[in-house]
């Protein structure tokens, strides 16, 4: 079942799914000057059987200027809709080494894809948050959000994370609530483009984060 809302927006933080639950959809978006080929699917879909999950359909972009003679780029499968960024792929490379049952890994990029990936998550999906460069995390619980469904309505749990500037006096957990929109629903559908710089973190922090993520994911 699709989550009909977005993960919460945390000030000075970005989020990422380490693996995508079956049913997740990724928009086949192309960069400016290119468009999806006419016969191409508008989405990639994470599908699977009992033993293996993979992305169905391939996103293909072709030049908007050309008629029917443009080269049809064969993208590499995989995508979704709700948040994005190709640059994030380089993060948490553990995701490429571990396969979670019933989940797809981050799809490889396809030629001329848009700078932002739009994923449509499904109920049960977990996304993980970390502070952008220059901010440090104050935790009062897991820095993650899960899409849940109650009475036919979907919602994301609130991540227990505050990102504070390195130069600011640090607050203790409990002093300040994370920024969230009313009813715990997201403030924006598509977050700004996250670059590698935004997501770059100290090596030891990265290692800790990876361990934390995979421990959590398997529990």
């Amino acid at each position: 079942e699709l989550c009909d809302d977005d993960p919460p927006k945390i000030t000075h933080a970005t989020f990422k799914a380490v693996a995508y639950k079956e049913g997740t959809m990724l928009n086949c978006e192309c960069k400016r000057g290119f468009r999806r080929i006419k016969s191409g699917s508008p989405y990639m879909l994470c599908t699977g059987n009992s033993s293996h999950s993979s992305w169905d359909n391939q996103c293909q972009c072709t030049s908007s200027a050309a008629r029917n003679t443009t080269k049809q780029v064969t993208p590499q499968p995989e995508e979704q809709k709700e948040r994005k960024t190709t640059e994030m792929q380089s993060q948490m490379q553990l995701a490429d080494q571990v396969s979670l049952p019933g989940h797809c890994r981050e799809p490889p990029p396809w030629e001329n894809e848009a700078t932002e990936r739009i994923y449509h998550f499904v109920v049960g999906q977990t996304v993980y948050y970390q502070c952008v460069q220059g901010y440090r995390a104050l935790h009062r619980g897991p820095a993650e959000s899960v899409c849940k469904m109650t009475h036919g309505k979907t919602r994301w749990t609130q991540p227990q994370l505050i990102c504070t500037g390195e130069t600011e006096p640090s607050q203790f957990p409990g002093e300040e609530e994370p920024q969230a929109s009313p009813d715990g629903l997201p403030e924006s559908e598509t977050s700004r483009l996250v670059t590698t710089t935004d997501f770059r973190i100290q090596t030891e922090v990265a290692a800790t984060m990876e361990t934390f993520i995979f421990t959590t994911e398997y529990q």
């Epitope: 079942e1 879909l45 009475h151 309505k153 929109s181 009313p182 997201p186 559908e189």
Partner: antibody, heavy 116, light 106 residues
Amino acid sequence: QVQLVQSGAEVKKPGSSVKVSCKASGYTFTSYRMHWVRQAPGQGLEWVGYINPSSGYTEYNQKFKDKATITADESTNTAYMELSSLRSEDTAVYYCARGGGVFDYWGQGTLVTVSS
Amino acid sequence: DIQMTQSPSTLSASVGDRVTITCSASSSISYMHWYQQKPGKAPKLLIYTTSNLASGVPARFSGSGSGTEFTLTISSLQPDDFATYYCHQRSTYPLTFGQGTKVEVK
């Protein structure tokens, strides 16, 4: 209580455009996506697309991607759907429905008739 | 796109009858949702996530199924139940509905 109130019936000429409104009250407008559903005379329901009012992000059924444009105005808690290049086959009742999962609240519907 | 096929398209029944409407999805889906619509009115949520009754819906309505086959049952048809019923999936975009089943007076 939650209410979605739509604009009145419209009669339009082929080739023209129409903009249907859906005013929400009784809940936080930006906390739920607003979906639009179409029903041609004597036919079933077809999903057109949705908007996230807080960000303006839209997702469309590919069938209506070149026909419908969904927008929202946070200041008035109103969602809009504009239909362009109208043809007789666009004659239908158009409903807005509150998202966030199943459609628990619907507008009363707006009949758009396209006739020369 | 996931196609939803309802059967029958029209069902003639009398008050007190047990009525069953089926909905087949062209691909496996997580849940089915059901709406009731009366002439000139907006659809109304009847059953969500396959088997849960929406607020205010009488217990004579029930839903079941999984995968690609789902059923809506009215255990004892009442005068207020003559309407058109639609199944709906929101497991994948585009969201789709069945073509509808009209329950009419026999």
